[in-house]
Amino acid sequence: IWELKKDVYVVELDWYPDAPGEMVVLTCDTPEEDGITWTLDQSSEVLGSGKTLTIQVKEFGDAGQYTCHKGGEVLSHSLLLLHKKEDGIWSTDILKDQKEPKNKTFLRCEAKNYSGRFTCWWLTTISTDLTFSVKSSRGSSDPQGVTCGAATLSAERVRGDNKEYEYSVECQEDSACPAAEESLPIEVMVDAVHKLKYENYTSSFFIRDIIKPDPPKNLQLKPLKNSRQVEVSWEYPDTWSTPHSYFSLTFCVQVQGKSKREKKDRVFTDKTSATVICRKNASISVRAQDRYYSSSWSEWASVPCS
Amino acid sequence: RNLPVATPDPGMFPCLHHSQNLLRAVSNMLQKARQTLEFYPCTSEEIDHEDITKDKTSTVEACLPLELTKNESCLNSRETSFITNGSCLASRKTSFMMALCLSSIYEDLKMYQVEFKTMNAKLLMDPKRQIFLDQNMLAVIDELMQALNFNSETVPQKSSLEEPDFYKTKIKLCILLHAFRIRAVTIDRVMSYLNAS
């Protein structure tokens, strides 16, 4: 058993049929010595008396808010949550496996630049009685500060018969140098509580590996005289690290119709312009990637050919 | 400790091409090592990230773009002095700081070159003959060092009398390649910045 926060405790349980569970001793936070009784949740049934209460925690029915009273007055609360371990593996029932970039990916994180700011998100099908708390640091043995905001519901989607909820959080490394060479990874830890179930999820990464630039901005077309060719130009996204001559991007320019299976023109360039062949009912799209360290491509920025 | 904006003419900067070749060569070598040593801990997640140049050179700080010198987090207190007669400078106006930056890069290359050569000598003794260092990568390091053209004491190649532990050597190769790739990225960014300035 360990304390998650004030008056909230996590009981770690090996979860299998007829498991003995964990013996837990609760102590009432009061100077009083006698006349103390204990109840669980909304029930008025007295579970025991005295300053301490010993319970055997085996299942979710044994978890919940234990309250000690004296003469009708509440003295203190202790909320017990359960953390299940099945076959030596901690449960991951609350969050959905995103399976990208690999199996057992529950948290995904991205950074728009090298400033030390990043966003992480996760998915769940649970809609109520759900809370998240996020902590982060650079390194684990001698952790350096990363400040994370509160996790918020950022999107709702319908997937078949189920609704899927996306939560996200923004974090900022306290003292980040965009040009620094990372040797210690960022660690992100998410505590998830659904009703009386506790789970924790972690992710470890270097900012350089989660870089995904914003799409290029200000796409413009200039038809070339006596030619089907069009000069397309664009600019670096505002959110990208500066100076751009140091933090350079490379670009992919593509002309394609509405269907992915349609024929296309595609060219890669380090410049902020390119010449492509435009077709009727097609779009010109441009995306960006760090020129020197190949992490993710940005989303496409598009303009119609016509 | 930072790069000035007024530096060489874009066409006068011979090191940019060499630094691009360097990044390409080390990336290819790292990819080859990951594939060949698939049953060794050789991915970024599996290895310890060590920097053999730590406390010996200060390339990131010495080569910091002017625009980042306002960022407190980028200003490290480490100071290192270097010889300043590089041929990549290509301009009389080149400042002492830029010379410091380029000589720091030269020192990095020299240290990695020694490590890689020592390691290759060990790998050549491996009866499995599983992996060797790409000669192209060693040649590219040499070319960039020649283009930088700094005079500096030659570092003797480390020789070891004890029987090499090939497992450890291969893991060390992975660690070294990961670190060198990160440094090659920095070098490429620096050269690109200097070329554009």
């Epitope: 089907r228 490379t250 299976r261 349609e262 024929k263 023109d265 595609r266 890669f268 360039t269 | -």
Partner: antibody, heavy 118, light 107 residues
Framework: QVQLVQSGAEVKKPGSSVKVSCKAS????????LHWVRQAPGQGLEWMGW????????EYAPKFQGRVTITADESTSTAYMELSSLRSEDTAVYYC???????????AGQGTLVTVSS | DIVMTQSPLSLPVTPGEPASISCRAS??????LHWYQQKPGQAPRLLIY???QSISGVPSRFSGSGSGTDFTLTISSLQPEDFATYYC?????????FGQGTKVEIK
């Protein structure tokens, strides 16, 4: 399976024209760009131009501009390359090639040898 | 026009040994570079597109690398069927241009 079948070998006199055909099978004809590339005996490859069979758009290499015409007939899934004012240096194997990507080719025909000789 | 220069023009190799072919562009072409294999009397066959992307059906011993002006096609261990002529082609701008070809022959 995508296939491109070209017309047979031709012998032509200098100053005349030649029209080589390329019939496509497998896949929708207009879903691909079609290129013509030639190769003189013992020499390398030389790109001549492309056509978009969907709309008839063409682009030619400056070297052949004014002498080459590439056309396509969607109804028969056939592309044609006509080269006029033939000279001896036009003696070559002419290949048609196609791809969904405009700037390179993933399937080519078997080639048509055009010999220009007086 | 962008000029593509291949080297060497002839490459004698022992079967089972690796082979590398170089292709240099007269100006930077990013990764707009493709490799073809051609055997006598046959049409060119695409091996690698956009400098390093492999084609399904092409043996994994063929790999490509490079960007900017310098590119390499590597055959990790030459098989008897790999003896052929190899061409690089740039797609950075029209007209599309090819290298002169490198003939890989049995040593």
């Amino acid at each position: 399976q995508v296939q491109l079948v070209q017309s047979g070998a031709e012998v032509k006199k200098p100053g005349s024209s030649v029209k080589v055909s390329c019939k496509a099978s497998g896949g929708t004809f207009s879903d691909y760009y079609l290129h013509w590339v030639r190769q003189a005996p013992g020499q390398g490859l030389e790109w001549m131009g492309w056509i978009d069979p969907e709309n008839g758009d063409t682009e030619y290499a400056p070297k052949f501009q004014g002498r080459v015409t590439i056309t396509a007939d969607e109804s028969t899934s056939t592309a044609y390359m006509e080269l006029s004012s033939l000279r001896s240096e036009d003696t070559a194997v002419y290949y048609c090639a196609r791809n969904k990507e405009l700037r390179y080719f993933d399937v080519a025909g078997q080639g048509t040898l055009v010999t220009v000789s007086s | 026009d962008i000029v593509m220069t291949q080297s060497p023009l002839s490459l004698p190799v022992t079967p089972g040994e690796p082979a590398s072919i170089s292709c240099r562009a007269s100006q930077s072409i990013s990764i707009n570079l493709h490799w073809y294999q051609q055997k006598p009397g046959q049409a060119p066959r695409l091996l690698i597109y956009f400098a390093s992307q492999s084609i399904s059906g092409v043996p994994s011993r063929f790999s490509g690398s490079g960007s900017g002006t310098d590119f390499t096609l590597t055959i990790s261990s030459l098989q008897p069927e790999d003896f052929a002529t190899y061409y690089c082609q740039q797609s950075n701008s029209f007209p599309l241009t090819f290298g002169q070809g490198t003939k890989v022959e049995i040593k």
